[in-house]
């Protein structure tokens, strides 16, 4: 059952409850005591396990995967699994900690002596949402661009948004995945109402920037339900 | 920090049911994961539900699968668990909990922001 396949997985020996968030079983790794996250909360103690649901990696942390965590499971359940690190099986390139990047389904080091000058690599883009298979559309993209451990630029090729600087995100843009910036207060934004429709964008957006939701523009209540511009907005 | 205040907890009979109501307000709702947890007496804080942003990802503890169903109104800024078929073993303060929004927020491992609690009491 999902039960135990996550218990075996359970964040032991946290600090004392102090009323913040907490650690959940997608991480095999306990969480280091003491660390305070962006919000300043604590953990609370919990010796059980605490499944996030995903429906895509970028739901999840940037130590995480999304995925079904168990191979014939749920077909309904994704939750946000620990990154896999080096020399580790994978599928897609999110599934591997950052600093990595999947190759012929192994996680290897993305460090710049592995990038040096213009080099060819498979980037898996699953366009549904079982991001656990490999299915979908697979294509090779050539990277033009050396990848550092600078973190991205604007227009700077990605694997996920962790690559990219301070306000912005890994986004599709045609083929490929570039560094966007996330997006401000009054920007158009893409609103999602199918399950899995954000993977046929080959102009993906940025999500709203903090403090921030997509949400229909007030003077589009009375437009049809096609022609409804979401935009940025304020909490 | 995001404020969340959980309603609709009460007494019932068991094989009855209740709907649990939790408003998330504060520095942001972010509209990522809402869950919801219980801790019985003298027991641990366990996992009941959760859905994701997009509502297309549910999962829920084996002991009420089936049961209770977790949904969310992101409009509203509110989260639900119908629970049906109560049993006396559900008794219990059940917290609401917000996700963090992951990396789109900076953070390292996606989490939950926990409420007060509402007391459910099953027992004829």
């Known amino acids: 059952t999902l039960n135990s396949v996550l218990n075996s997985n359970a964040i032991k020996n946290l600090p004392p409850p102090l009323g913040g968030a907490a650690g959940h079983p997608g991480s095999a790794v306990s969480a280091a005591p003491g660390i305070l996250y962006p919000g300043g909360n604590k953990y609370q103690t919990i010796d059980n396990y605490q499944p996030y649901p995903c429906a895509e990696d970028e739901e999840c942390g940037t130590d995480e995967y999304c995925a079904s965590p168990t191979r014939g499971g749920d077909a309904g359940v994704q939750i946000c699994l620990a990154c896999r690190k080096r020399r580790k099986r994978c599928m897609r390139h999110a599934m591997c900690c950052p600093g990595n990047y999947c190759k012929n389904g192994i996680c290897v080091s993305s460090d710049q002596n592995h990038f040096r000058g213009e080099i060819e690599e498979t980037i898996t883009e699953s366009f549904g949402n079982d991001h656990s298979t490999l299915d979908g559309y697979s294509r090779r993209t050539t990277l033009s661009s050396k990848m550092y451990h600078t973190k991205g630029q604007e227009g700077s090729v990605c694997l996920r948004s962790s690559d990219c600087a301070s306000g912005l995100c890994c986004a599709r843009h045609f083929w490929s995945k570039i560094c966007k910036p996330v997006l401000k207060e009054g920007q158009v934004c893409t609103k999602h109402r199918r399950k899995g429709s954000h993977g046929l964008e080959i102009f993906q957006r940025c999500y709203c920037g903090e403090g921030l939701s997509c949400r229909i523009q007030k003077d589009h209540h009375q437009a049809s339900n096609s022609s409804r511009l979401h935009t940025c907005q304020r909490h | 920090e995001v404020q969340l205040v959980e309603s609709g907890g009460g007494l019932v009979q068991p094989g009855g049911s209740l709907r649990l109501s939790c408003a998330a307000s504060g520095h942001t709702f972010r509209g990522y994961a809402m869950g919801w947890f219980r801790q019985a007496p003298g027991k641990e804080r366990e996992f009941v539900a959760a859905?994701?942003?997009?509502?297309?990802?549910?999962v829920y503890a084996d002991s009420v699968k089936g049961r209770f169903t977790i949904s969310a109104d992101n409009s509203k800024n509110t989260a639900y668990l119908q629970m049906n078929s109560l049993k006396p073993e559900d008794t219990a303060v059940y917290y609401c909990?917000?996700?963090?929004?992951?990396?789109?927020?900076?953070?390292?491992?996606?989490?939950?922001?926990w409420g007060q609690g509402t007391l459910v009491t099953v027992s004829s």
């Open positions: 859905i994701n942003r997009s509502g297309s990802s549910t």
């Open positions: 909990a917000a996700g963090n929004g992951g990396r789109a927020y900076g953070y390292s491992r996606a989490r939950y922001e």
